[in-house]
């Protein structure tokens, strides 16, 4: 940051990802000010003419807000005074992806920072034993993914083994015609082993584990957003 007559202040953003149809958060923090009325927050998006959101004099100022964000944005008004300029984005759309900028003006100074926002769909996989199959089979299902992910199976016992020949993955378009349901079936499963179904696209990586023994079945799921510093 350079120095102007009104000093530059540090503004920090975090790259993040939004799940289509759900609410997302564009993270931005700044050096706080003692007076809420002296703080101005402006969010812009590359390629959009109007503002994404503006907050000034302690309240939203939406007269210049772009149509594509109408009724979908909010700041955490009670947290602005402590330096939180993060934006809540309702009902994330695929077209919300892009480069955003968080502009801050306070009595202490001015600053801004860019943020890359990715959009897609990602969900936790659930792995179950498929009792309907003729042989011991595992079925991994995840309801919403976009873009189309890759699915890889792994096993604790056979580490490094390639299961592509003994698995079958299908993608079924959901009713909104964007996201897809992911179903992957693993055949010839052995007992007393832990299997992992790993689903990944450029936005998220999710893993569903299942431990199958003679006496019990244990499941665990985990989802991690990629290229996000959070």
């Amino acid at each position: 940051f350079g120095i102007s007559g009104r000093h530059s202040i540090t503004v920090t953003t975090v790259a993040s990802a939004g799940n289509i149809g759900e609410d997302g958060i564009l993270s931005c923090t700044f050096e706080p000010d003692i007076k809420l009325s002296d703080i101005v927050i402006q969010w812009l998006k590359e390629g959009v003419l109007g503002l994404v959101h503006e907050f000034k004099e302690g309240k939203d100022e939406l007269s210049e807000q772009d149509e594509m964000f109408r009724g979908r944005t909010a700041v955490f008004a009670d947290q602005v005074i402590v330096g939180n300029a993060s934006l809540r984005l309702k009902n994330v759309q695929l077209t919300d992806a892009g480069t955003y900028k968080c502009y801050i003006i306070t009595s202490k100074g001015k600053g801004n920072a860019n943020l890359e926002y990715k959009t897609g769909a990602f969900s936790m996989p659930e792995v179950n034993v498929d009792y309907n199959a003729s042989s011991e089979t595992l079925r991994c299902e995840a309801p919403r993914w976009f873009p189309q992910p890759t699915v890889v199976w792994a096993s604790q016992v056979d580490q490094g083994a390639n299961f592509s020949e003994v698995s079958n993955t299908s993608f079924e378009l959901n009713s909104e015609n964007v996201t897809m349901k992911v179903v992957s079936v693993l055949y010839n499963v052995t007992i007393n082993n832990t299997y992992s179904c790993m689903i990944e696209n450029d936005i998220a990586k999710a893993t569903g584990d299942i431990k199958v023994t003679e006496s019990e079945i244990k499941r665990r799921s985990h989802l991690q957003l990629l290229n996000s510093k959070a």
């Epitope: 350079g2 007559g5 959009v48 210049e64 801004n112």
Partner: antibody
């Protein structure tokens, strides 16, 4: 290399129409808002119009509102300015410029429009 | 509508520092951009968002913005800096340009 090349200027009589084009290359055209800016002979810069990356939002200067129409064809990477009911005071060099946040970071070399009887 | 006022001309000797001002109501609450335009050429962005320089612009060009005045400072002025300079802001869905300043290198 990012490049903007304007065309379509010329001499036109008052009340007539003209369409300017701006061919863009070297960047993802559809993801950037674009502007038209003009400069009358010996005068300063005057913003004319702006359009969002998708083309869904447009803004105009009061001096051209209702007479000029900005548009874009993202499949052809081209920006347009349809100028109707031209007046002598529309005589200027017309520049297309790429919007960058609150400013403009890349400009074309301009095309000259002369409105004269 | 919002207005930006610049001095019509500024003269400076080579090697000295030139300061070009841009005045506007509460200008410090806006983000100011500066353009250089040489005769017969298109404008070139030299300072954006008050203080930042695009790549390829010499460090001799710097900006500041406070109160009602923004300033473009060109240190160690060279003959090739002779041009018209315009400040610009965004206000109420319009781009506003300053009146322009002709920099003459003596």
């Amino acid at each position: 290399e990012v490049q903007l090349v304007e065309s379509g200027g010329g001499v036109v009589q008052p009340g007539r129409s003209l369409r300017l084009s701006c061919a863009a290359s070297g960047f993802t055209f559809s993801s950037r808002s674009m502007n038209w800016v003009r400069q009358a002979p010996g005068k300063g810069l005057e913003w004319v119009s702006a359009i969002s990356g998708s083309g869904s939002t447009v803004y105009y200067a009061d001096s051209v509102k209702g007479r000029f129409t900005i548009s874009r064809d993202n499949s052809k990477n081209t920006l347009y300015l349809q100028m109707n009911s031209l007046r002598a005071e529309d005589t200027a060099v017309y520049y297309c410029a790429r919007k960058r946040w609150y400013g403009m970071d890349v400009w074309g070399q301009g095309t000259t429009v002369t409105v004269s009887s | 509508s919002y207005e930006l006022t610049q001095p019509p001309s500024v003269s400076v000797a080579p090697g000295k520092t030139a300061r070009i001002t841009c005045g506007g109501n509460k200008l410090g609450d806006k983000w100011v951009h500066w353009y250089q335009q040489k005769p017969g050429q298109a404008p070139v962005l030299v300072v954006y968002e008050d203080v930042d320089r695009p790549s390829g612009i010499p460090e001799r060009f710097s900006g500041s913005n406070s109160g009602n005045t923004a300033t473009l400072t060109i240190s160690r002025v060279e003959a090739g800096d002779e041009a018209d300079y315009y400040c610009q802001v965004w206000d109420s869905r319009t781009y506003v340009f300053g009146t322009g300043t002709k920099l003459t290198v003596l």
